[in-house]
């Protein structure tokens, strides 16, 4: 039970992370002008990772897309790379995630099969959520820097005569939209994780068939080389993971934690 | 055709307060912002200040803070410039302007009301 | 406040000729955003209000001749009338509509010779 709940939150939770990701993405406002301490302008700057908008004081908003790739600063572009990777992974890690789920049935899945793809999904969003974590990151270190940049150089001019006021920019809500949504894609990865070690088949190495011979006791053990993989330690209770291959034996007598030889 | 309608002139005495008043006609009143300019008599324009019908937002010049007030009625489509301890220095003409919705330039403008403060 | 400067401040001109009017900002009216200007140009005729002619430094007002001709950039900007016309005797203001508070330039008043 609480395995089920610890996936289908950690499904939920990546699910909105991933949203998140998506819209801040999209936002046009990961940067926007500078308000404090700036001379008031009628007309109010921002910048998203696709187009920069112009809003005049009467409402009125024009966006211009950024039309050129090879004219882009390529920290913009590694921005936009990591985004897109994180959505693409957040993507497929939903698609994956949704066969996991312990509360939908698929044909006879087995659950060692929804505990690796629970694993697998559980993975791909936490590198998802790291993407946008490091692609918002990147971002705001970069306009960190073009902060100060321009700060030091707020006014140049012909021998302080005419003056030209630049344009700062501060972080905007894309930001701070990215990485809450990456923190959550990041959360829902380690719940799917930790989901993942609880859908594993409780399984012992001793998966025993008695054959009571005459005089002394033989175990066989079926399994091929899984029951000796110790290597020299302790494996009484190991739990073995086998991906769901068994014997014919196995599939009729499913042996208990109580079966010893 | 867009009509900001004004009084023709406000005679008034040094220290009194006037209220100048722009009904706009012909347009959705609370989407554009509504401005005030000074112009004194052969001299130049002076910007004092605009407001937004829809939320009375507004923007004073520092030169005419505590001078003029901004106000309007939506009901009746109205903007009010009050104008308040006058002096000689504020004889002039005052126009009102509709703000365009493109850029911050002045579309439209009334045909001013010419304030005369004497004794 | 922004200081716009209009010359000449008087201009004796004859029906027919070439007009050419300069207004200079004491900043930078350009905005990086969009990469536009925002100067206004104003026509005043005696008597009556402003009207509007040009805004962002060289878009036309629909309805105004095309023989107005806003161009410039940053802090250096003209007006061009190409062929004067009686009807265009007025006096010309420039605006600063980037900063707060907004500011008029002293004008170019034509007069006929």
């Known amino acids: 039970m609480a395995v089920t709940a610890c996936q289908g939150l950690g499904f939920v939770v990546s699910l909105i992370g991933i949203a998140g990701i998506i819209a801040a993405t999209c936002m046009d406002q990961w940067s926007t002008q500078d308000l404090y301490n700036n001379p008031v302008t009628a007309v109010f700057n921002y910048q998203g990772l696709w187009r920069s908008c112009v809003r005049e004081s009467s409402g009125f908003t024009e966006c211009r897309g950024y039309f050129t790739l090879l004219g882009l600063p390529a920290m913009l572009q590694a921005v936009r790379a990591l985004m897109i990777v994180g959505i693409v992974l957040g993507a497929i890690g939903l698609l994956v995630s949704i066969f996991a789920l312990k509360c939908i049935r698929i044909g006879s899945m087995e659950d060692s099969a929804k505990a690796n793809m629970t694993l697998t999904s559980g993975i791909m969003f936490i590198v998802s959520g790291l993407c946008a974590i490091a692609g918002v990151s990147v971002f705001a270190n970069m306009l960190v820097t073009n902060f100060w940049m321009s700060t030091a150089n707020m006014y140049t001019g012909m021998g302080g005569m005419v003056q030209t006021v630049q344009t700062r920019y501060t972080f905007g809500a894309a930001l701070f939209v990215g990485w809450v949504a990456g923190g959550l894609t990041l959360i829902g990865g380690v719940m799917m994780c930790i989901a993942c070690r609880g859908l594993a088949p409780e399984e012992t190495n001793y998966k025993a068939v008695s054959y009571h011979a005459s005089g002394h006791s033989v175990a066989y053990k079926p399994g091929g080389f899984k029951a000796s993989t110790g290597f020299g330690s302790n494996t009484k209770n190991k739990k073995i993971y086998d991906g769901g291959a068994r014997t014919e034996d196995e599939v009729q007598s499913y042996p208990s934690k109580h079966d010893y030889v | 055709q867009v009509l900001l309608q004004q009084p023709g002139t406000e005679l008034v005495k040094p220290g009194a307060s006037v209220k100048v008043s722009c009904k706009a006609s012909a347009y959705t009143f609370t989407s554009y912002w509504i401005h005030w300019v000074k112009q004194r008599p052969g001299q130049g324009l002076e910007w004092i200040g605009r407001i937004r019908p829809s939320d009375s937002d507004s923007t004073y010049n520092q030169n005419f803070k505590g001078k003029a007030t901004l106000t309007v009625d939506k009901s009746s489509d109205t903007a009010y410039m009050q104008l308040t301890s006058l002096t000689s220095e504020d004889s002039a003409v005052y126009y009102c302007s509709m703000g365009a919705y493109y850029s911050n330039s002045f579309g439209y403008w009334g045909q001013g009301s010419l304030v005369t403060v004497s004794a | 406040d922004i200081v716009m400067t209009q010359s000449p401040s008087s201009l004796t001109v004859t029906a027919g000729e070439k007009v050419t009017m300069s207004c200079k900002s004491s900043?930078?009216?350009?905005?990086?955003?969009?990469?536009?200007?925002?100067l206004t140009w104003y026509q005043q005729k005696p008597g009556q209000p402003p009207k509007l002619l040009i805004y962002?430094?060289?878009t036309r007002e629909s309805g105004v001749p095309d023989r107005f001709t806003g161009s410039g950039s940053g802090t250096d900007f003209t007006l061009t009338i190409s062929t004067m016309q009686a009807e265009d005797l007025a006096v010309y203001y420039c605006q600063n509509d980037y900063f707060f508070p907004y500011t008029f330039g002293g004008g170019t008043k034509l007069e006929i010779k």
């Open positions: 900043q930078s009216l350009l905005n990086g955003g969009n990469q536009k200007n925002y």
């Open positions: 962002w430094a060289s």
